[in-house]
Interface confidence: low
């Protein structure tokens, strides 16, 4: 006597109350593997979530986030508000990065500028709220006899004053 549950394909469930017949998953439910005793309820993408992939009888719906938000967590379990580059999200909303920190993305936290001197290097390009500093060659590399390097002028993005 074979266990019929093992023969139930994805998209069905082993209906134990009906002598373990393989029954199709009801509407708005799915089973992604064979031999399942129940079908799982399809995920619904509501509010700040939007549907990236519709639910089928064999696979769950997939969500992403509406514009102005980005996914967090496995399978986009949460949507978090976007901030501008040069900002980080706090409990009170988007706040500019403090001096000495930067964020070059619309998500995440502000991170400290690289400390060029720890590597014995000099600052080639100053940091901004949106960009890390660019470290240049070490002073030893600029001593007489070393190959000459002409540092470029510090980069300045339009609309941002030096910090």
């Amino acid at each position: 006597l074979q266990d019929p549950c093992s023969n139930c394909p994805a998209g069905t469930f082993c209906d134990n109350n009906r002598n373990q017949i393989c029954s199709p998953c009801p509407p708005n439910s799915f089973s992604s593997a064979g031999g399942q005793r129940t079908c799982d309820i399809c995920r619904q993408c509501k509010g700040v979530f939007r549907t990236r992939k519709e639910c089928s009888s064999t696979s769950n719906a997939e969500c992403d986030c509406t514009p102005g938000f980005h996914c967090l967590g496995a399978g986009c379990s949460m949507c978090e508000q976007d901030c501008k580059q040069g900002q980080e999200l706090t409990k009170k909303g988007c706040k500019d990065c403090c001096f000495g920190t930067f964020n070059d993305q619309k998500r995440g936290i502000c991170r400290p500028w690289t400390n060029c001197s720890l590597d014995g290097k000099s600052v080639l390009v100053n940091g901004t709220k949106e960009r890390d500093v660019v470290c240049g060659p070490s002073p030893a590399d600029l001593s007489p006899g070393a190959s000459s390097v002409t540092p470029p002028a510090p980069a300045r993005e339009p609309g941002h004053s030096p910090q």
């Epitope: 006597l1 074979q2 266990d3 019929p4 549950c5 093992s6 134990n16 109350n17 009906r18 002598n19 373990q20 017949i21 005793r37």
Partner: antibody, heavy 117, light 111 residues
Amino acid sequence: DVQLQESGPDLVKPSQSLSLTCTVTGYSITSGYNWHWIRQFPGNKLEWMGYIHYSGSTNYNPSLKSRISITRDTSKNQFFLQLNSVTTEDTATYYCARGALGAMDYWGQGTSVTVSS
Amino acid sequence: DIVLTQSPASLAVSPGQRATISCKASQSVDYDGDSYMNWYQQKPGQPPKLLIYVASNVESGIPARFSGSGSGTDFTLNIHPVEEEDAATYYCQQSNEDPWTFGGGTKLEIK
């Protein structure tokens, strides 16, 4: 080969609880099938009592629903019958069995239980 | 509950002959094209042994002389040719509706 073995007390007093164990060898009770308890009264009438599905869900005979509980210990590959508030009417040979499609293909040898004061 | 009535209550058959056991259900045990009726053999001091499941499927290891037929409410177990070792009590059992129920049994004696 799949084998089932019932164990438990031979004698239970009226109003007490009857507890039986079915030890399964040769097949994991979490891998498939239903795992049943059936009893046979003196005079040979058979009664299906209920089962625990390999997933852990249960299904009981409505006539026993208020008194019966079937549980399992997956680490020991055992499942259990508890029947509360027994009377002399519960005197029977109790079998555990494996089943699918509503049929039972492997049975234990059975254990005889007498309810008497 | 679905009541299963077996007949005859007992019968005696000579080796090599045919034994026919009937099982009538108080309501249909059919579902989705299948009939959820099973047959068991029980010898004294032993547990029941599955012979036939879903009306006509012979369980693995059971001799081909055992066969089952029927649908709806009327089912039959046939044993042909009967052998000495077939002396036992035979039970039908339905699993289409809770609670699953058994017939009262038919005792087969070998002449």
